[in-house]
Interface confidence: low
Amino acid sequence: APVRSLNCTLRDSQQKSLVMSGPYELKALHLQGQDMEQQVVFSMSFVQGEESNDKIPVALGLKEKNLYLSCVLKDDKPTLQLESVDPKNYPKKKMEKRFVFNKIEINNKLEFESAQFPNWYISTSQAENMPVFLGGTKGGQDITDFTMQFVSS
């Protein structure tokens, strides 16, 4: 059976939206009005992985692009990147672990923990217009809480 997916946008807990700042980089900033059209639409696929009531494994692709968020080691540090894939083969139910995030729901907020690097989370900076990254701390300066907005297909 084809993998189940939904289209959505994400905003961090400060209401910053995610937009492209390069072909392989996302940034977070406040958008208003018409500029909201610039935000990235994700295709969130529900994939194979360790699942529990509050923890659901997902892959985050960019809608209509053959790009997926993935977690890799760079200079010995877990790093978030946008990785190009063959659109004929993705999305799939059994995604490679670097593409998998544990979507964790806490108090109506979402966290996205890397399956490859436990306790590392998709994060944004407090500052405006900065890259989205993989952070190893929760509850500190950096933001790890998101809300999800559904987008019709």
Epitope: V19, M20, S21, G22, P23, Y24, E25, K27, D35, E37, Q38, E64, K65, K74, E128, N129, M130, P131
Partner: antibody, heavy 118, light 107 residues
Framework: QVQLVQSGGGLVRPGGSLRLSCAAS????????MNWVRQAPGKGLEWVSS????????YYTDSVKGRFTISRDNAKKSLYLQMNSLRVDDTAVYYC???????????WGQGTMVTVSS | ELVSTQSPSSLSASVGDRVTITCRAS??????LNWYQQKPGKAPKLLIY???RLESGVPSRFSGSGSGTDFTLTINSLQPEDFATYYC?????????FGQGTRVEIK
């Protein structure tokens, strides 16, 4: 006001090297991707290279891969293009431009002429 | 490589005319399409980003539209200072590519 000031062009022999610089003022330089674009005499615009805000990601057009290196020094608010193994068809005016991909390239430097000739 | 094709390559128009330039991408690029104006001996200047967003300080007679593969730059009531070359540019994927340019000349 936001300004990009370029330096480093000139005449060089084929196979030679040049380093272009682009100094920024009036903006939070470290927040933005930066680009190099060139324009051969009488021709259109051609994107050469881009670098992400923190310098983690670098992109090049195929014809300069392995010969040109883009870099940045956010502390100095400067962008660089190291050009090695220069060829006659690299002759062009080279522009630096600030540019995230959702907002286009603006502003642009004044341009610097690179002439590769024997 | 994603190709951006502009048409026409040149056009002659009079002050006050409405001018339309089109840009076609070889594949869907959503709204990642920008328009620039360049005058001889000068650096390009951004007019429109994100297909239809007017860059700050650009006169409102310039407008952009389109999404996917087909885009349009319109100049309503052409002014003397608008005679220049116009370029579209896709920022959907690398290599970033420009159209070949449209030269707007005085009739």
């Amino acid at each position: 006001q936001v300004q990009l000031v370029q330096s480093g062009g000139g005449l060089v022999r084929p196979g030679g090297s040049l380093r272009l610089s682009c100094a920024a003022s009036g903006l939070i330089f470290s927040n933005y991707s930066m680009n190099w674009v060139r324009q051969a005499p009488g021709k259109g615009l051609e994107w050469v290279s881009s670098i992400s805000s923190a310098g983690s990601y670098k992109y090049y057009t195929d014809s300069v891969k392995g010969r040109f290196t883009i870099s940045r020094d956010n502390a100095k608010k400067s962008l660089y293009l190291q050009m090695n193994s220069l060829r006659v068809d690299d002759t062009a005016v080279y522009y630096c431009a600030r540019g995230d991909y959702d907002t286009g390239m603006e502003p642009w430097g004044q341009g610097t002429m690179v002439t590769v000739s024997s | 490589e994603l190709v951006s094709t502009q048409s026409p390559s040149s056009l002659s128009a009079s002050v006050g005319d409405r001018v339309t330039i089109t840009c076609r991408a070889s594949q869907s690029i959503s709204r990642y399409l920008n328009w620039y104006q360049q005058k001889p001996g000068k650096a390009p200047k951004l007019l429109i980003y994100g297909a239809s967003r007017l860059e700050s300080g650009v006169p409102s007679r310039f407008s952009g539209s389109g999404s996917g593969t087909d885009f349009t730059l319109t100049i309503n009531s052409l002014q003397p200072e608008d005679f220049a070359t116009y370029y579209c540019q896709q920022s959907y994927s690398t290599p970033l590519t420009f159209g070949q340019g449209t030269r707007v000349e005085i009739k």
